[in-house]
């Protein structure tokens, strides 16, 4: 039975040209995390593997930095970065947990972070 929950940064906004940290946290489970995938819609951004470390997709190498922790930092944001991002936690023995973050990149200098929320 999967007992864990994913907490994410929820709906967030950031300024064009700026940077943002995408973070998810898996809680309420004793399962071991073996890998975390970060995806934008259907596009793989990065993989963090417990045995192999980080792999950043070549097309994002210059604009993505891993961390802090299992999070991901997006830099030099453009309006095209607006959209859904997913953290996919591969765990043993539970299986897969997925969290969703919606990022809006604003032209304006008024960009405020949304509240945290949980996905069971």
């Amino acid at each position: 039975m999967m007992t864990g929950t994913i907490e994410t940064t929820g709906n967030i906004s950031a300024e064009k040209g700026g940077s943002i940290i995408l973070q998810c946290h898996l809680s309420s489970t004793t399962a071991q995390v073996t890998q975390v995938n970060w995806e934008q819609q259907d596009q793989l951004l990065a993989i963090c593997n417990a045995d192999l470390g980080w792999h950043i997709s070549p097309s994002f190498k210059d604009r993505v930095a891993p961390g802090p922790g299992l999070g991901l930092t997006l830099q030099s944001l453009t309006v095209n970065d607006t959209g859904e991002y997913f953290c996919i936690y591969h765990t043993y023995p539970d299986g897969t947990y997925t969290g969703r973050i919606f990022l809006e990149v604003l032209e304006s200098s008024v960009a405020e972070h949304g509240a945290r929320f949980q996905i069971p």
């Epitope: 907490e7 940290i21 946290h25 898996l26 809680s27 004793t30 995390v33 975390v36 963090c48 593997n49 417990a50 192999l52 470390g53 980080w54 792999h55 950043i56 190498k61 210059d62 993505v64 930095a65 891993p66 961390g67 802090p68 922790g69 299992l70 930092t73």
Partner: antibody, heavy 117, light 107 residues
Framework: EVQLQQSGTVLARPGASVKMSCKAS????????MHWVKQRPGQGLEWIGA????????RYNQKFMGKAKLTAVTSASTAYMEISSLTNEDSSVYYC??????????WGQGTSVTVSS | DIVLTQSPATLSVTPGDSVSLSCRAS??????LHWYQQKSHESPRLLIK???QSISGIPSRFSGSGSGTDFTLSINSVETEDFGLYFC?????????FGGGTKLEIN
């Protein structure tokens, strides 16, 4: 086998600079952050900063901005830390450690720096 | 910066005792907390990752618990090789920070 081999003991004068190295082997150097941690004799651990050789991203503890400079040469799988304007407060053991998102799982043996006139 | 406060600073125990070491964060760090052991004249060693996840090669007598701001490292039936310094460290946000440490010594 993963190994982090650090350069040897350094004795330096106040005001001088030192550059120490951390040679990585046994894993993909560009897939892990390399952290640098300071430990004064008989004291705790203090995080200086980290470099991600995959794209040379760096993160610093504000306290060490301008004091420590982190670099990496991927072709040699080696990370470097340069400490400038040395004072007695910089006399410490400095550790490098790797982190791939799951804690700092391997550490170097430490480089001892003594600042003395 | 996130401040990690460890207590007690020193813990005197007898081999065979079970002990708990505390680490408290100045703000919520969810489960982004790791524990390290450092023996005299040695480099630190990772004991527990993400508050409670075990590390290959670390004896099962070491376990971790907690989330948010309060975390505990437990050692079930301390052995003589366990004496030394213990540090917690957060990876929730930059800059990473360490706690001040707990010294586990022989009573």
């Amino acid at each position: 086998e993963v190994q982090l081999q650090q350069s040897g003991t350094v004795l330096a004068r106040p005001g001088a600079s030192v550059k120490m190295s951390c040679k990585a082997s046994g894993y993909s150097f560009t897939s892990y952050w390399m952290h640098w941690v300071k430990q004064r004799p008989g004291q705790g651990l203090e995080w200086i900063g980290a470099i991600y050789p995959g794209n040379n991203a760096t993160r610093y503890n504000q306290k060490f901005m301008g004091k420590a400079k982190l670099t990496a040469v991927t072709s040699a799988s080696t990370a470097y830390m340069e400490i400038s304007s040395l004072t007695n407060e910089d006399s410490s053991v400095y550790y490098c450690s790797r982190e791939g998102g799951f804690g700092m799982d391997y550490w170097g043996q430490g480089t001892s720096v003594t600042v003395s006139s | 910066d996130i401040v990690l406060t460890q207590s007690p600073a020193t813990l005197s125990v007898t081999p065979g005792d079970s002990v708990s070491l505390s680490c408290r964060a100045s703000q919520s760090i969810t489960n982004n907390l790791h524990w390290y052991q450092q023996k005299s004249h040695e480099s630190p060693r990772l004991l527990i990752k993400y508050a409670s996840q075990s590390i290959s090669g670390i004896p099962s007598r070491f376990s971790g618990s907690g989330s948010g701001t309060d975390f505990t490292l437990s050692i079930n039936s301390v052995e003589t090789e366990d004496f030394g310094l213990y540090f917690c460290q957060q990876s929730n946000s930059w800059p990473y920070t360490f706690g001040g440490g707990t010294k586990l010594e022989i009573n």
